[in-house]
């Protein structure tokens, strides 16, 4: 079945942009001017998920790349990674759970909770140029709020 998708960039609440850091990692840093062209463009897709009142299930792929953010256990800890997929089969309505994030949208701020690991969120550090990761706390030192901008 076809899925609704859009292209966007994400910035954290400190206005740090997300860029590639090696082939399978994202990092967050402040960008200005022409450097903004480095930021990753996501293909966000509306997928099937658990019933909920305020959470919308999405998958986050990298535009024009066969890479999706996914959540897996590594050394017994929920971990965010970029995973290669077969572009002929993705995106799809019924994405595997590790690819699904529950988008929580309040006052133009977005949070992305892992469907696989409830209460774990896509997060960035306060520090510059640190990896984007899966964090188990909201409202602490680490940043879990993002803003989204459409990209044409």
């Amino acid at each position: 079945a076809p899925v609704r998708s859009l292209h966007c960039t994400l910035r954290d609440a400190q206005l740090k942009s997300l860029v590639m850091s090696g082939p399978y990692e994202l990092k967050a840093l402040h960008l200005q001017g022409q450097d903004l062209e480095q930021q990753v463009v996501f293909s966000m897709s509306f997928v099937q998920g658990e019933e909920s009142n305020d959470k919308i299930p999405v998958a986050l792929g990298l535009k024009a790349k066969n890479l999706y953010l996914s959540c897996v256990l590594k050394d017994d800890k929920p971990t965010l990674q970029l995973e290669s997929v077969d572009p002929k089969n993705y995106p799809k309505k019924k994405m595997e759970k590790r690819f699904v994030f529950n988008k929580i949208e309040i006052n133009n701020k977005l949070e992305f909770e892992s469907a696989q690991f409830p209460n774990w969120y896509i997060s960035t550090s306060q520090a510059e140029s640190m990896p984007v990761f899966l964090g188990g706390t909201r409202g602490g030192q680490d940043i879990t709020d993002f803003t989204m901008q459409f990209v044409s």
């Epitope: 076809p2 998708s5 019933e51 988008k103 977005l110 459409f150 044409s152």
Partner: antibody, heavy 119, light 108 residues
């Protein structure tokens, strides 16, 4: 004040074209999904389509090919281009903002603009 | 996905409890919204995700259901509630569909 204002409606002959505009104030269209919904006189609501970024538009099956939704973020305006109009396209056309991205429901509506297709 | 509301018209009195039903042609989980529309006005979102009350909507309105069967209940009709009500499938792939509407009128 957060609001939507539609314009561009009017009388058009069958086979003609019309472009409707929907201008947003109080918020930016750079991160808001916008839909068009129409209502024929005395009839129910009918979804036309929705736009996210300029390359991501989705339409009701009956609207594909004849209707095109676009946006100009610099003018904070969304458009509905309607071609090959027929009498059955006569309706009030509303633009509406999606409550949250992919929520599919609409929390902010314009006042509507009437399109009449008649010779 | 086709959305079918019943009844098409409903007459009731102030203070009555009113129930409007909406049936989807296939399961839509809880991806259903309800709107109220008054003549010459734009629709107003009442309920989303089948049971969540939209901001500013009085608590006499409630929604329930999941899968393919949904209901909108007005616990005690007020004069301001006489209007047309629409259900809407909000999560059906790339397409969004409204029910045909239920017109709520004053009895007598």
């Amino acid at each position: 004040e957060v609001q939507l204002v539609e314009s561009g409606g009017g009388l058009v002959q069958p086979g003609g074209s019309l472009r409707l505009s929907c201008t947003a104030s109080g918020f930016s269209l750079s991160s808001a999904a916008m839909a068009w919904v129409r209502q024929a006189p005395g009839k129910g609501l009918e979804w036309v389509g929705i736009i996210y970024d300029s390359a991501s538009t989705y339409y009701a099956s009956w609207a594909k090919g004849r209707f095109t939704i676009s946006r100009d973020t610099s003018k904070n305006t969304v458009y509905l281009q309607m071609n090959s109009l027929r009498a059955e396209d006569t309706a009030v056309y509303y633009c509406a903002r999606e409550r949250a991205i992919f929520s599919g429901d609409f929390v902010l509506w314009g006042q509507g603009t009437l399109v009449t297709v008649s010779s | 996905i086709v959305m079918t509301q019943s009844p098409s018209t409903l007459s009731a009195s102030v203070g009555d409890r009113v129930i409007i039903t909406c049936q989807a042609s296939q399961s839509i989980d809880n991806w259903l919204s309800w709107y109220q529309q008054k003549p010459g006005k734009a629709p107003k979102l009442l309920i989303y995700r089948a049971s969540t009350l939209a901001s500013g909507v009085p608590s006499r309105f409630s929604g329930s259901g999941s899968g393919a069967e949904f209901t909108l209940t007005i616990s005690s009709l007020q004069p301001d509630d006489f209007a047309t009500y629409y259900c809407q499938n909000t999560g059906g792939g790339v397409s969004i569909a409204f029910g045909q509407g239920t017109k709520l009128t004053v009895l007598g």
